[in-house]
């Protein structure tokens, strides 16, 4: 076509490859389908798949017989039954199975690529009965003000169509109560809010709602809990539990329907004012909307007068002809009881209270009939003197007696048996019990019970501090408030190490956090203290910039505890601490690792049998170089399993082949002097594989760090653009490239075609062939 020193014009020629369908389709996956009874679900490609080396997925046709327990339809036409579909339709999620009839069934099918047929297959369809959750019960809880009320099966009763065990019917609290709290009887209610509970716990009466008394009076208040009932595989059910807190309700724990009805203590023969601290019906007024409240009042009608004294309003005696007083008079301090003398017997009066409308008009509203107790005490009575109390400390799950160190009074004119204590409010970390008084909690006991060691505390709750609010009286003096502090210590603690401490390489230091050190017992221990019992080898622990051997959880949480490398010869370190929380200790080892300041390539698979250039697109410690003002060094610690890192000759003229490398620098990477020979996994069929390099990265003035380059490999595909620079391709590919007739399988450009940059050495296709075939 030309003389030796001449060239012809370029000639284009077309190569047409005629496909030959000579490979049969192979059914590779046929797992069958599990679905809900009566449902329609797609047949996923993961359940039914076939391959064919020389046919596309749209040419692979499944021809089916009438299914025994439903029908096959296409997504676009769910009303029309089909008898055939393609792999492409399966891949697109377009093939649906609509279940009807027996639970176990399926359909027979054959598979064809148009040329070859693979008959006699069966696709199994198993339907499961749909499990339905249902909620019965009133879903309304009536609670007495300030009291604890268990949720019951009358309130909340879940069941499932499958007869699920109540232990597996789980409620999640989506939105907790606003006027109180939900807690578990066996756990502490002062800690975190209850998030989950089971129907079994409801049946056991262990799920409790506690109403917290607000500072402002109310007559009726409404709270709601939003719950989600779940029990896989059933669908979740949302539920709302309505809580009505009302003074209307008959409350065994609270005999009065009034905001306050505490009674009065008066010295014999003397007078005492009855104030709203003792008698207060303002909760009746609270039933009136606030704009109109000032126009209403509560009328008290005395139905039985005191027998040993007299009631006076504004110094006017009340009597059968004038038996009324008002809440407003009470609030103004105008109601007085005057004792007539002649003994210290109990007194009191009975009354009816109801809402009174504007100017005395009738108004619909709450009413109550009650008694007000008046205790007359001896004028010579010396009231009991409470003594200082030492908190009771015991471990969770144990029992300890209450002694005089916790509860004692000095009372010269009362015997220990006459000094009575009443529990006003109990903590949730346990309960008081009396020896021989049954297993349950006691709410009343005497000083004699304490002195004889009969009173004990049972720590059945969580390990938190709690306080008993007590009322103490000798029966002749007004009750005095007392408190008993109980501190429950954990039986054991654990130091939780969620992650090793990662030190950024360029910094060489890092703050510890709860990820490294956190102490838990049955709850988190925020006041834990730590002592270093084995220090780090290559660094120091610092607080406020100074080395330390002791620090607190608070300092950790504030980010004040820092680990700093001082010896830059290791990429990891460790230290051991002893944690102490509320008298219990535990030790733990904190591991320290250095996080390499290295940008590692994360792209698609690399071709097996090829050599690719290791350059800053694959590994780049440039930022570390800038930060340290040095040339980072790499040491190969491990890998690759299939292949090797080599130093490549700079030019064809350079003597010798590529040499194995165990150490290299950032400069080597930037110079393009390194290659990675990607090997083929031996002893197995060709296919995708994974491999990695483990490197140690060093730089001046910082600790070394271990990093890994993980990569996927696959058999070389000349049609695929590889996003790394290829220095050579596999032998077979080179042989093919040398044949004049050859072309890439798809007619696309050959192995140098890639993105983002050409994958061959500069100089184009011929120089690539020259460099690799004839070097």
């Amino acid at each position: 076509a030309s003389e030796m020193d001449r060239q012809s014009h370029p000639v284009a020629f077309t190569v047409t490859v005629l496909p030959v369908n000579d490979q049969p389709p192979i059914l590779t996956t046929n797992t069958g389908l599990q679905m809900w009874e009566g449902a329609t679900a797609p047949i996923p490609a993961e359940a039914l798949r076939s391959t064919d080396g020389d046919s596309g997925s749209e040419d692979l046709v499944y021809t089916i017989e009438q299914p025994s327990n439903g029908r096959v339809v296409l997504r676009g036409a769910p009303g029309t039954e089909v008898r055939s579909f393609t792999q492409a339709q399966l891949d697109g999620g377009l093939v649906l199975f609509s279940h009807r009839g027996t639970l176990d069934g399926g359909f027979r099918f054959r598979l064809s690529d148009g040329e070859h047929t693979s008959p006699g297959h069966f696709f199994r369809v198993t339907a499961q009965k749909q499990v339905l959750l249902s909620l019965k019960g009133s879903q309304t809880l009536t609670v007495c003000p300030g009291s604890v009320q268990p949720l019951s099966s009358q309130t909340l009763r879940a069941s499932s169509s499958a007869g699920t065990d109540p232990q597996l019917l789980l409620y999640r609290v989506v939105r907790g109560p606003q006027l109180g709290r939900l807690f578990h009887a066996q756990q502490d209610s002062t800690g975190e809010a209850l998030v989950n509970f089971t129907q079994a716990e409801v049946y056991a009466g262990n799920i409790l709602y506690e109403h917290e008394m607000p500072p402002e009076p109310f007559w009726e208040a409404h709270d709601t809990l939003e719950l989600q009932l779940s029990s896989p595989p059933a669908r979740d059910v949302a539920a709302t539990l309505a809580v009505a807190v009302s003074f209307e309700a008959a409350c065994p724990q609270r005999p009065s329907h009034l905001w306050k009805n505490k009674g009065l203590w008066v010295p014999e023969g003397q007078r005492a004012r009855i104030t709203v601290a003792a008698l207060d019906a303002s909760n009746l007024l609270a039933s009136v909307p606030s704009p109109q409240r000032s126009e209403h009042d509560v009328l008290f009608q005395v139905t039985q007068f005191p027998s040993r004294g007299q009631l006076l309003v504004s110094e006017e005696p009340l009597h059968a002809g004038q038996p009324h007083f008002l809440q407003s008079q009470l609030a103004a301090g105008q109601l007085v009881y005057a004792h007539g003398g002649g003994g210290t017997q109990q007194d009191g009066f009975h009354f009816r209270a109801h809402l009174q409308g504007p100017a005395g008009a009738s108004v619909a509203g709450p009413q109550t009939s009650e008694a007000f107790a008046i205790t007359v005490r001896d004028v010579n009575e010396r009231p009991p003197q409470p003594q200082a109390s030492v908190p009771l400390r015991l471990t969770r799950g144990s029992r300890a007696p209450i002694s005089r160190a916790q509860l004692s009074v000095v009372d010269p004119d009362s015997a220990p048996g006459e000094i009575e204590y009443e529990v006003q409010r109990a903590p949730h970390n346990g309960f008081l019990s009396l020896v021989g008084g049954g297993l349950g909690p006691v709410t009343r006991f005497t000083q004699a019970d304490v002195d004889s060691g009969r009173l004990a505390f049972v720590a059945n709750g969580s390990s938190v501090a709690g306080i008993f609010q007590l009322s103490m009286s000798d029966g002749a003096s007004p009750p005095l408030p007392m408190s008993l502090a109980v501190d429950i210590l954990p039986s054991a603690i654990e130091v939780q190490l969620r992650a090793p401490l990662e030190v950024p390489q360029a910094l060489g230091r890092s703050s510890l956090s709860q990820q490294q050190l956190r102490v838990v017992s049955d709850r988190e221990e925020p006041e834990a203290a730590y002592r270093l019992i084995q220090g780090p080898q290559y660094g120091h622990l610092l607080v406020g910039g100074r080395p330390t051997s002791a620090f607190s959880q608070f300092q950790i949480d504030q980010g004040e505890v820092v680990f700093a490398f001082t010896n830059f010869s290791s990429s990891h370190d460790h230290f051991r601490v002893l944690a102490l929380a509320r008298g219990v200790n535990a030790s733990a080892v904190v591991n320290v690792t250095v996080r390499a300041l290295l940008h590692v390539w994360a792209g698609g698979p690399w071709p097996q049998g090829a050599t690719l250039r290791l350059d800053p697109t694959v590994l780049d410690a440039g930022e570390l170089a800038n930060r340290t003002g040095s040339v980072p060094r790499f040491r190969l610690l491990e890998g690759p399993r299939h292949g090797r890192v080599v130093r490549v000759p700079r030019a064809r003229t350079e003597p010798g082949g590529s040499q194995l490398v165990e150490q290299f620098t950032q400069q080597d990477l930037e110079d393009g002097r390194l290659g990675l020979e990607v090997g083929r996994p031996e002893g197995r069929a060709p296919g995708p594989a994974g491999d990695s390099l483990t490197l140690e990265l060093w730089a001046q003035g910082v600790p070394p760090a271990v990093a890994s380059l993980d990569f996927a490999t696959e058999p070389y595909n000349a049609a695929r653009p590889y996003s790394v620079a290829l220095l050579s391709v596999p032998e077979a590919a080179r042989t093919e490239a040398g044949k004049p007739e050859s072309s890439t399988p798809t007619g696309e450009p050959g192995p140098m075609a890639s993105s983002p940059e050409p994958a061959v050495a500069k100089g184009g296709f011929l120089s690539f062939l020259e460099a690799n075939m004839f070097s």
Epitope: A332, A361, S362
Partner: antibody, heavy 117, light 113 residues
Framework: EVQLQESGPGLVKPSETLSLTCVVS?????????WSWVRQPPGKGLEWLGT???????YYNPSLKSRVTISVDTSKNQFSLRLSSVTAADTAVYYC??????????WGQGTLVTVSS | ELVMTQSPDSLAVSLGERATINCKSS????????????LNWYQQKPGQPPKLLIY???TRESGVPDRFSGSGSGTDFTLTISSLQAEDVAVYYC?????????FGPGTKVDIK
């Protein structure tokens, strides 16, 4: 025992405003009572005009509402009635009364007001 | 508003005899909040202010002689003077305190026969 005493002009011209005061003695006007005005035309029955609480809340007879105003002065322990645009039909004995619970418990002696030009 | 009617307009009774006055309200004055009838009876002698006799339909005010008694519920009420005395000559008014406006009956004049 609380005593009430009405005072004010005995003669008022038509279209003018009738003003009466009730002084409370023997007890505080700030106590838990409502204070009312009731009138009785000569030879006729009783008619409630309105009621006030010491804090200023008032209730009026709707038939007179546009004309009647009751006010309280706790510092002077008294309350007052103003009736505007009077006519001869407003001639009556005007009583102040203490409303206790749901009844008029104590009454003043009453004062006759004649509307005449 | 609640309208109160009384009957008779007047009655004359011999000394020592029983006098009965009726009062009717246009709607019930029985309160649901305390089960009381908000109905009061007053006595007015010539030249004097009215005086409370009975409240809540049947409760005698302190200091009122026990010959005066009240009864009834809902809409129908009665004031009875069991043995008329000379000092009982007066006009008797019933009054509802159930709702605003508070209203009085027209009055019943009691004389000695």
């Amino acid at each position: 025992e609380v005593q009430l005493q009405e005072s004010g002009p005995g003669l008022v011209k038509p279209s003018e405003t009738l003003s009466l005061t009730c002084v409370v003695s023997g007890g505080s006007i700030s106590s838990s009572n409502w204070w009312s005005w009731v009138r009785q035309p000569p030879g006729k029955g009783l008619e409630w005009l309105g009621t006030i609480y010491y804090n200023g809340n008032t209730y009026y007879n709707p038939s007179l509402k546009s004309r009647v105003t009751i006010s309280v002065d706790t510092s002077k322990n008294q309350f007052s009635l103003r009736l505007s645009s009077v006519t001869a039909a407003d001639t009556a004995v005007y009583y102040c009364a203490k409303s206790w619970v749901s009844w008029f418990a104590s009454w003043g002696q009453g004062t006759l007001v004649t509307v005449s030009s | 508003e609640l309208v109160m009617t009384q009957s008779p307009d007047s009655l004359a009774v011999s000394l020592g005899e029983r006098a009965t006055i009726n009062c009717k309200s246009s709607q019930s004055v029985l309160s649901s909040s305390n089960n009381k009838n908000y109905l009061n009876w007053y006595q007015q002698k010539p030249g004097q202010p009215p005086k409370l006799l009975i409240y809540w339909a049947s409760t005698r005010e302190s200091g009122v002689p026990d010959r005066f008694s009240g009864s009834g519920s809902g809409t129908d009420f009665t004031l009875t003077i069991s043995s008329l005395q000379a000092e009982d000559v007066a006009v008797y008014y019933c009054q509802q305190h159930y709702s605003v406006p508070f209203t009085f009956g027209p009055g019943t004049k009691v004389d000695i026969k």
